[in-house]
Interface confidence: low
């Protein structure tokens, strides 16, 4: 009832501002009255608040359990030894850029960008990806030159499906090579990149689909398609993973007016797959080899077969003509990695399950910065990690195998009372050699009480103190995999719990 | 009955703005891009651009890029084409016109609002 | 942007006389549809569409009213020339971006 006439008040309040406003009475009188408003709208705010408010993390986001984060770090730890392995650099860039920087540079998909509400001064956007911001960053500290990854959280004003791995919020691992080099060999190596993280995260069998943005415009071109318009049908092309030819073409046609025998001339093209001999067959193709874009985009991948051959991991790519990514800013080669779900019967293909790493060539990108617009080629891949956790958390889920949150190498833990001040004794002599080391915050903790932390943890040994071993001088260890329990010198304790744990010599 | 109603007439001098709106009724708002063409006094079409509502999707005449700017609110369908830095050159009727499908590829133009005349004088 | 040549620039046609109006243009066709309209503007009147896509008769239009041609070449054929009919009529193109119009053709009752 409170609620109700509070309510009434805002109505009438509302219509005695708007009436004042029609009479152009003076704005003394006008600003009065619209503060009680507020006021009111406050009390009514609050009020709400009390009866509705929910505790939950906002749409499209998520929070990270100990469980989920020890995933993402082994994730996360399998991607950057192979990114440092190929000899890149890393950076950073902040989360938010100038609205202008992002403008223009993703086609359809910038309406999911979002905006932060103007603080009265620059309008802001958070970044959609890596590679936008990167290229920024090229131009405006004039580099030619680089091979960087960068590892950071992107915002997308999607509607997702969570429960398939997308978010709203969600991180990329990106790695990208910029420079004049040399035609293809950065593309391959970034493929061999892609193809040893999917191989080192054991994550199912997946294949690599490779086109060039060129051999998709001079096919739009050949088939008829206008120019002004190969973008938006790039996207209805894109579609073919997931639905098929007969709805991409219903799309085309009912949706996009494209005339049916230009979408049937685009079938026949986007429905061929295959390797390096389609490459070749296509060069011959009487229609697409008369055409200049086609024919480059044809004379590159033809190259970089040979070169997928020399690195070992041709028999991970196909040549897909339906392969059309999104952004507007690829220029060249373009791959996309699908995890593959073996057939049900035999003879089938495989089936590819979603995206979970793609990249390509984008040499215009820099170019949009540069106030001369000096190009800087660029090629470079990105991980949907994100698809990888939620991959790697229901494969950990299946097999009921315990993740260790922690990294603790030793617990120490006393079998009697009154032996709290051997333990932080004991415990802060293994911190400061380096050692990861815990122990129970009470007086007098029950032995069983100690142990049962530490086999729950999944901590490897345990050191225990009793009143006989401080007389001795000796300190009990027992490994939680061997249940074996030895008498160690106290002044030899922490180079057998290193070579117990195959820890290399550090402090900190 | 499908119907677009035009802003009235409007007087600028060179180097003001104008912006001028298309009130859509009588269909789905959203389905269908809204173009826009003027008409010098004596003179032919000359299409300047469209936009649709349905995603915001925009096609431009490169002529009027720098200066058209084709807005539309799909709360009260209602379309708007703002074209600054008036010129004498610029004074036309401007239509607004139904395009035959949204996002269509070629779509001829089937329903048009009344014009608005825009005189730019000094 | 594509040049939309039409002809003649006026045509003066008596009642009941059939008026033809031609419009060239570099190719605005595919093998299935051509991308041709006609439009009819009536003095202080906005344009309204006559003929879409080269023959197809727009709805309400009278059948007096036909459309032919693909490739370059597309006319407009008035069989019989009607009072009401005196305008000027426009063909129009959306093949590619821009649209662009023919300058149009004014036809009067002779």
């Known amino acids: 009832a409170d609620r109700a006439a509070l309510e009434e008040l805002v109505r009438l309040q509302g219509a005695h501002v708007r009436g004042l406003k029609e009479q152009k009475a003076s704005a003394e009188q006008i600003e009065e009255e619209v503060t009680k408003l507020l006021k009111l709208k406050a009390q009514l705010g609050q009020d709400e608040g009390k009866q509705k408010f929910v505790l939950k993390t906002p749409k499209g986001t998520r929070d990270y359990s100990p469980r989920q984060m020890a995933v993402r770090e082994k994730v996360f730890d399998v991607i950057i030894r192979c990114f440092k392995r190929h000899g890149a650099e890393v950076i950073d860039t902040p989360v938010f850029e100038l609205k202008e920087t992002l403008t223009g540079k993703y086609g359809e998909d910038s309406k999911l960008i979002y905006d932060l509400k103007d603080q009265g001064g620059e309008l802001l956007s958070l970044r959609y990806d890596l590679t936008v911001p990167f290229a920024r960053y090229l131009a405006m500290n004039k580099l030619t030159n680089i091979k960087r990854y960068h590892i950071a959280k992107v915002y997308r004003r999607d509607n997702p499906a969570m429960t398939r791995g997308r978010y709203r919020e969600f991180y990329q691992c990106d790695f990208d090579i910029a420079g004049q080099f040399d035609p293809m060999i950065p593309d391959a190596e970034c493929l061999k990149i892609m193809c040893e993280i999917l191989s080192s995260l054991q994550i199912g069998n997946f294949l690599v689909k490779v086109n060039d943005r060129r051999i998709l415009d001079g096919m739009f071109a050949v088939c008829g398609v206008p120019d002004s318009k190969f973008r938006t049908i790039c996207s209805s092309v894109d579609k073919l993973d997931k639905v098929s030819w007969e709805e991409v073409k219903n799309e085309m046609v009912g949706e996009k007016g494209l005339a049916p025998e230009v979408a049937d001339r685009i079938g026949d093209y986007v429905q061929q797959h295959g390797g390096v001999s389609l490459v070749e067959q296509l060069l011959q193709d009487p229609k697409l080899s008369q055409n200049k874009q086609a024919v480059e985009g044809l004379g590159d991948l033809k190259l970089l077969f040979e070169y997928l051959i020399l690195f070992g991991i041709d028999d991970k790519i196909s040549f897909d003509l339906s392969l059309a990514r999104g952004l507007d800013y690829y220029t060249g080669v373009i791959y996309e990695a699908v995890l593959l779900q073996m057939p049900t019967q035999a003879g089938e293909e495989p089936l590819g399950v979603g995206s979970i790493a793609a990249g390509g060539r984008y040499d215009g990108l820099v170019g949009m910065f540069d106030p001369k617009g000096r190009k800087v080629p660029c090629v470079g891949l990105s991980i949907g990690v994100e698809r990888i956790f939620s991959i790697v958390e229901q494969r950990l889920e299946a097999s009921e195998e315990k993740v260790r949150t922690t990294e603790t190498q030793v617990l120490v833990a006393s079998a009697q009372k009154k032996l709290l001040e051997e333990r932080l004794k004991l415990v802060s002599e293994l911190w400061d050699a380096g050692i990861k080391a815990e122990l129970l915050y009470k007086k007098n903790p029950k032995l069983l009480n100690q142990l049962q932390y530490w086999e729950e943890a999944g901590i490897p040994l345990v050191a225990i103190i009793g009143e006989q071993e401080l007389r001795d001088g000796v300190i009990k260890l027992r490994s939680v995999a061997s249940r074996e329990e030895v008498d160690v010198r106290r002044e030899d304790l922490v180079e057998e719990i290193r070579r117990r744990t195959n820890q290399p010599l550090s402090t900190c | 009955q499908v119907q677009l109603v035009q802003s009235g007439a409007e007087v600028k001098k060179p180097g003001a703005s104008v912006k001028v709106s298309c009130k859509a009724s009588?269909?789905?708002?959203?389905?269908?891009?809204i173009g826009w063409i003027r008409q010098a006094p004596g003179q032919g079409l000359e299409w300047m651009g469209d936009i649709c509502p349905g995603d915001t999707y925009t096609n431009d005449n490169e002529k009027f890029k720098d200066r058209a700017t084709m807005t539309a609110d799909t709360s009260t369908s209602t379309a708007y084409m703002e074209l600054s830095s008036l010129r004498s050159e610029d004074t036309a009727v401007y239509y607004c016109?139904?395009?035959?499908?949204?996002?269509?590829?070629?779509?001829?133009?089937?329903?048009w609002g009344q014009g608005t005349l825009v005189t730019v004088s000094s | 942007d594509i040049v939309m040549t039409q002809s003649p620039d006026s045509l003066a046609v008596s009642l009941g006389e059939r008026a033809t109006i031609n419009c060239q243009s570099q190719?605005?066709?595919?093998?299935?549809?051509?991308?041709m309209h006609w439009y009819q503007q009536k003095p202080g009147q906005p344009p309204k569409l006559l003929i879409k896509y080269a023959s197809n008769l727009e709805s309400g239009v009278p059948d007096r009213f036909s459309g032919s041609g693909s490739g370059t070449d597309f006319t407009l054929t008035i069989s019989s020339l009607q009072a009401e009919d005196v305008a000027t009529y426009y063909c129009g193109h959306s093949y590619e971006i821009p649209w662009t119009f023919g300058g149009g053709t004014k036809v009067e009752i002779k």
């Open positions: 009588g269909y789905t708002f959203t389905d269908y891009c």
């Open positions: 190719s605005v066709s595919t093998s299935t549809y051509n991308y």
């Open positions: 016109a139904r395009g035959e499908e949204q996002l269509g590829l070629r779509n001829a133009m089937d329903y």
